[in-house]
C-alpha cells in the first residue's frame, strides 16, 4: 500500500497521527468497525499529552476509545501493551459492574465527562474517535 503522508479530509492532525471525531453515537463494535474500514482504529491513548488533546476535542461527552476486555484482559485495539501503558481511569474503575440490568458486565472503555476513563456496557451508543498514524503503509488504495 501507499504511505499516508497527510490526514484525510475532516480529520485532525496531531503529533504524526490523524484523528476523526464523531458527532453522534454508536455501539462500541459499530464504532470499531467504522474506524477499521477507514484504515484506522479507535483511539489508543498512549500519553497524558494525547489524553489532553482528545479531551479538548470531545468535550464533556461519553466517548468510546479503543480499549476493551471482551476476551478477558484489557487490550488496546492496536496491540499497545495495556499493563505498561498510560491509564487514566476514574477512581474505583474499571469495576465490570453487573448492576445495570442489561446483561453481562462492562467490557468497553470510554472517556467520561471529565475525560477520565470508565468501563461500560459495549452496546451503549456513545460517540467515538478514530485514529490513524501518519507514515504508516495504507492497507487499501483510496479508490477501487
Amino acid at each position: 500500500g501507499s504511505e499516508r503522508t497527510c490526514c484525510p479530509v475532516n480529520w485532525v492532525e496531531h503529533e504524526r497521527s490523524c484523528y476523526w471525531f464523531s458527532r453522534s453515537g454508536k455501539a462500541w463494535a459499530d464504532a470499531d468497525n467504522y474506524c477499521r474500514l477507514e484504515d484506522a482504529h479507535l483511539v489508543v491513548v498512549t500519553s497524558w499529552e494525547e489524553q489532553k488533546f482528545v479531551q479538548h476535542h470531545i468535550g464533556p461527552v461519553n466517548t468510546w476509545m479503543g480499549l476493551h476486555d471482551q476476551n478477558g484482559p484489557w487490550k488496546w485495539v492496536d496491540g499497545t501493551d495495556y499493563e505498561t501503558g498510560f491509564k487514566n481511569w476514574r477512581p474505583e474503575q474499571p469495576d465490570d459492574w453487573y448492576g445495570h440490568g442489561l446483561g453481562g458486565g462492562e467490557d468497553c472503555a470510554h472517556f467520561t465527562d471529565d475525560g477520565r476513563w470508565n468501563d461500560d456496557v459495549c452496546q451503549r451508543p456513545y460517540r467515538w474517535v478514530c485514529e490513524t498514524e501518519l507514515d504508516k503503509a495504507s492497507q487499501e488504495p483510496p479508490l477501487l
Partner: antibody, heavy 113, light 107 residues
Framework: QVQLVESGGGLVKPGGSLRLSCAAS????????MNWIRQAPGKGLEWVSY????????YYADSVKGRFTISRDNAKNSLYLQMNSLRAEDTAVYYC??????WGQGTLVTVSS | DIQMTQSPSSLSASVGDRVTITCRAS??????LGWYQQKPGKAPKRLIY???SLQSGVPSRFSGSGSGTEFTLTVSSLQPEDFATYFC?????????FGPGTKVDIK
Amino acid sequence: QVQLVESGGGLVKPGGSLRLSCAASGFTFSDYYMNWIRQAPGKGLEWVSYINSNGFTIYYADSVKGRFTISRDNAKNSLYLQMNSLRAEDTAVYYCAADTIYWGQGTLVTVSS
Amino acid sequence: DIQMTQSPSSLSASVGDRVTITCRASQGIRNDLGWYQQKPGKAPKRLIYAASSLQSGVPSRFSGSGSGTEFTLTVSSLQPEDFATYFCLQHTSFPFTFGPGTKVDIK
C-alpha cells in the same frame, strides 16, 4: 426515527442509465459510511458499492465496476448511485444502507427491452 | 472474496420451537458478522451485530454466537412474527458478502 428512502428506480432499456437517490433522516448522516445493496427477484442479496463518510473512499463489486458511480452529499443528507450501461442482470430491488445498521425499503430497477 | 454459506436454506417450525441457523465463512472474519431478518416487501432489520451483540430493541429470544469462520443465530422460542427470511452479512473486508438466506415458515 431513522429513515432511508430510495427513489429513482423504474424500467429502462439495456444500455440505458438511471440515477438512484437515497434520502436519509433521523441520524447524523456524516457519521455513517453508506452502501448500495441489491436483490434480484427471487435471489439473495448482493453488495454493490460502499462510500465512506467524507466520500473519498469508494469500493464497487466487480459486477458493476466501471458502470456504476456512488456519491454522497452530506449537506443534503443524500446518497446517490449513477447506473450506466445497464444490463438485464442489473434488474433488482436496490437498497441503501447506513453502515450495515439501517436499511431503506428499496427501489425496483427493471432492465428490459 | 469471502464466501458465506448458510444452512439450512429453509426450515419449517412451530410457535415455541427453538430454531438454529448457521453461517460459515470461507476465511476468518473475526466477529464482523451481522444477522438480519427480512419480511416480504420490507427493509431488512438487523438483529445481531458483532456476531453476538443484540441490536437495541430486538427481543432477547434472539441470540448470536461464534467467531472466526462459524456463526450461529438462535431463536429460543419462535413467535408468530418471527416467520421470515434470515441472512448473515460479513463486513470485515470488501466485497461485503451475504449468506444466501434461510426461510423460516410455519410447520
